[in-house]
């Protein structure tokens, strides 16, 4: 492991479309990849009238946009579907929304998926 970097070996997995995709609905996903590549976790969710609906969570490929992010935070202003990525085991277990242009409280504090 490189000093100062959180190595990602597993992420929280969730798939709202698990029946159609024929995957598990929820669990822990081991992250595979080339040894010289970084691995990340991600989360995608929707905010439906203030109610958080998780779409997907899991491992994410080596992505410069995720480097050195220990927390999973969406910074884009009011996206249709929220996305965040991070480094570190299970770092996608909690996620939040802090739009870059505004100084406001996150609309979603750390959230975890409801059990099936």
């Amino acid at each position: 492991a490189i000093l100062g970097r959180s190595e990602t070996q597993e992420c929280l997995f969730f798939n709202a479309n698990w029946e159609k995709d024929r995957t598990n609905q929820t669990g822990v996903e081991p992250c595979y990849g080339d040894k010289d590549k970084r691995r990340h976790c991600f989360a995608t969710w929707k905010n439906i009238s203030g109610s958080i609906e998780i779409v997907k969570q899991g491992c994410w490929l080596d992505d410069i946009n995720c480097y050195d992010r220990t927390d999973c935070v969406e910074k884009k202003d009011s996206p249709e579907v929220y996305f965040c990525c991070c480094e570190g085991n299970m770092c996608n277990e909690k996620f939040s929304y802090f739009p870059e242009m505004e100084v406001t409280q996150p609309t979603s504090n750390p959230v975890t998926p409801k059990p099936p």
Epitope: K56, L61, F83
Partner: antibody
Amino acid sequence: EVQLLESGGGLVQPGGSLRLSCAASGFTFSHYAMTWVRQAPGKGLEWVSGISGSGLNTYYADSVKGRFTISRDNSKNTLYLQMNSLRAEDTAVYYCARRGHTMPQPLDPWGQGTLVTVSS
Amino acid sequence: DIQMTQSPSSLSASVGDRVTITCRASQSITRFLNWYQQKPGKAPKLLIYAASNLQVGVPSRFSGSGSGTDFTLTISSLQPEDFATYYCQQSYSTPPTFGGGTKVEIK
């Protein structure tokens, strides 16, 4: 080196059958989901079918559902596409591709393709 | 199914030109977007994954950007070997779908 090599294409009459093969090398075949993508002459890319690494889960485009069957033999490192009740609109170059097992699951690499022509 | 729309469908450019290709999804796909290059008679080749990450071995003149529904592939200085057809592909939901392609031709 990771390689995929398709075979089995050819000329077939409407209503006929054909089985395509894709021989994989250079990686642990059973660890990866695989896909078939086709390209009609002068047209774009169309996803046809996919299969999980174990072979337990299979997926099909609506245009081929009930006519095509995807399968794999992990002991032979080979992917198959059985095509039945072929139609003129199935004429295309068929590519096999490895699907990344980590999101966003890009298709890499691709085989060189095999041409299927459905004509009387 | 998610529809992917590319524009333009074709363009003519000269060596050294900056070329921009856009891809629009019918609904948000966050960053689940990959770009491929296909040369005549050859198989497609992965260029960019996750909207903006260069695949190993792809020259740095290629770049990708965007998230949500709108994405861009840019070639900063077109080279002779870049004349090809480019496709975007979403992997956010099943079935994965491709854009119609953008053919980059020599002016």
